[in-house]
Amino acid sequence: KDTTVKSGAKKDPKDSRPKLPQTLSRGWGDQLIWTQTYEEALYRSKTSNRPLMVIHHLDECPHSQALKKVFAEHKEIQKLAEQFVLLNLVYETTDKHLSPDGQYVPRIVFVDPSLTVRADITGRYSNRLYAYEPSDTALLYDNMKKALKLLKTEL
């Protein structure tokens, strides 16, 4: 889904039945700690020397919804995610480095604590390098482990 084609997606009013209180997780892992903004996430990543995982998604995108469910229910991914600074965004940032090959969703981009976008950590689709589908959880898990091997260890 290309967010330049359709943005400002709204939640179905019928979907606003009582649920758990809305958190920054937006359903990607309620037990995890999520940052609110990209700027905060970069600061936390640099100061804690932990990589940042940025998930771009839209409420009204079927592939975002589908990936969110498998991500949230995948125990190993959820456990490994504790070692990251986490951010999920339903809007695009002004940092073009977070969309190396376009503003599609869902896409997952990793950022090193040195504030280098890990453009080398890609999914399996040549036309959308940072896209993941529900069948790609094993690859995503491997890529998360790859991102944890930092580019430069700070002394």
């Epitope: 889904k1 079927p62 592939h63 589908a66 469910k69 529900p134």
Partner: antibody, heavy 120, light 107 residues
Framework: QVQLVQSGSELKKPGASVKVSCKTS????????MNWVRQAPGQGLEWIGW????????NYNGKFKDRFVLSADKSVSTVYLQISSLKAEDTAVYFC?????????????WGQGTLVTVSS | DIQMTQSPSSLSASVGDRVTITCKAS??????LSWFQQKPGKAPKTLIY???RLVDGVPSRFSGSGSGQDFTLTISSLQPEDIATYYC?????????FGGGTKVEIK
């Protein structure tokens, strides 16, 4: 093996409600999206909406937002489509269709269909 | 909503013929397209997903191709049991939308 078994045909009067069920077996019920599709007599297919049985999240085709409600009961691995204030134009076969085995959105397995006839 | 234009609406071919059905989306849908076969009075059966992936158990004479806006379902050698109506479906964006269908008959 995966099975989706739908409830039997219904004859209803205009203004009444109907609840169609789709009982599933052979896979992890809570982890696959369930779609509902309708087909009016002699017509093509129309997507009504989907539900994620794990947490009840739904999304509806705007055309069906007002009178159509999707729900799921994990205890009996069954999803439901309820239509209220029935109209003659709701006369159709209603199908449930499971999403991909891995949680993907594509429609993989289909129920046999339930004919709902609305007539006075 | 994304419009799916399927053509032809009907076709007649001989057993053994190569049959091609096309589906055109009103906007780019990546490869998020499925093909279904429906016989009279029966539920649809999924043949292809993600434009070109064959569902387990579907005969290899069925194949799908395309991405972006233009997609094709090909039956390499038409068999009598292939008489049915075929539908495409885009699942890139809500609401999912079907093509109008192609009725395949034997000459």
């Amino acid at each position: 093996q995966v099975q989706l078994v739908q409830s039997g045909s219904e004859l209803k009067k205009p203004g009444a409600s109907v609840k169609v069920s789709c009982k599933t077996s052979g896979y992890v019920f809570s982890r696959s999206w369930m779609n509902w599709v309708r087909q009016a007599p002699g017509q093509g297919l129309e997507w009504i909406g989907w539900i994620y049985p794990g947490d009840g999240d739904t999304n509806y085709n705007g055309k069906f937002k007002d009178r159509f409600v999707l729900s799921a009961d994990k205890s009996v691995s069954t999803v439901y489509l309820q239509i209220s204030s029935l109209k003659a134009e709701d006369t159709a076969v209603y199908f449930c269709a499971r999403g991909g085995y891995d949680g993907s959105p594509w429609l993989s397995y289909w129920g046999q269909g339930t004919l709902v006839t609305v007539s006075s | 909503d994304i419009q799916m234009t399927q053509s032809p609406s009907s076709l007649s071919a001989s057993v053994g013929d190569r049959v091609t059905i096309t589906c055109k989306a009103s906007q780019d849908i990546n490869s998020y397209l499925s093909w279904f076969q429906q016989k009279p009075g029966k539920a649809p059966k999924t043949l292809i997903y993600r434009a070109n992936r064959l569902v387990d158990g579907v005969p290899s004479r069925f194949s799908g191709s395309g991405s972006g806006q233009d997609f094709t379902l090909t039956i390499s050698s038409l068999q009598p049991e292939d008489i049915a109506t075929y539908y495409c479906l885009q699942y890139d964006e809500f609401p999912f939308t079907f093509g109008g269908g192609t009725k395949v008959e034997i000459k």
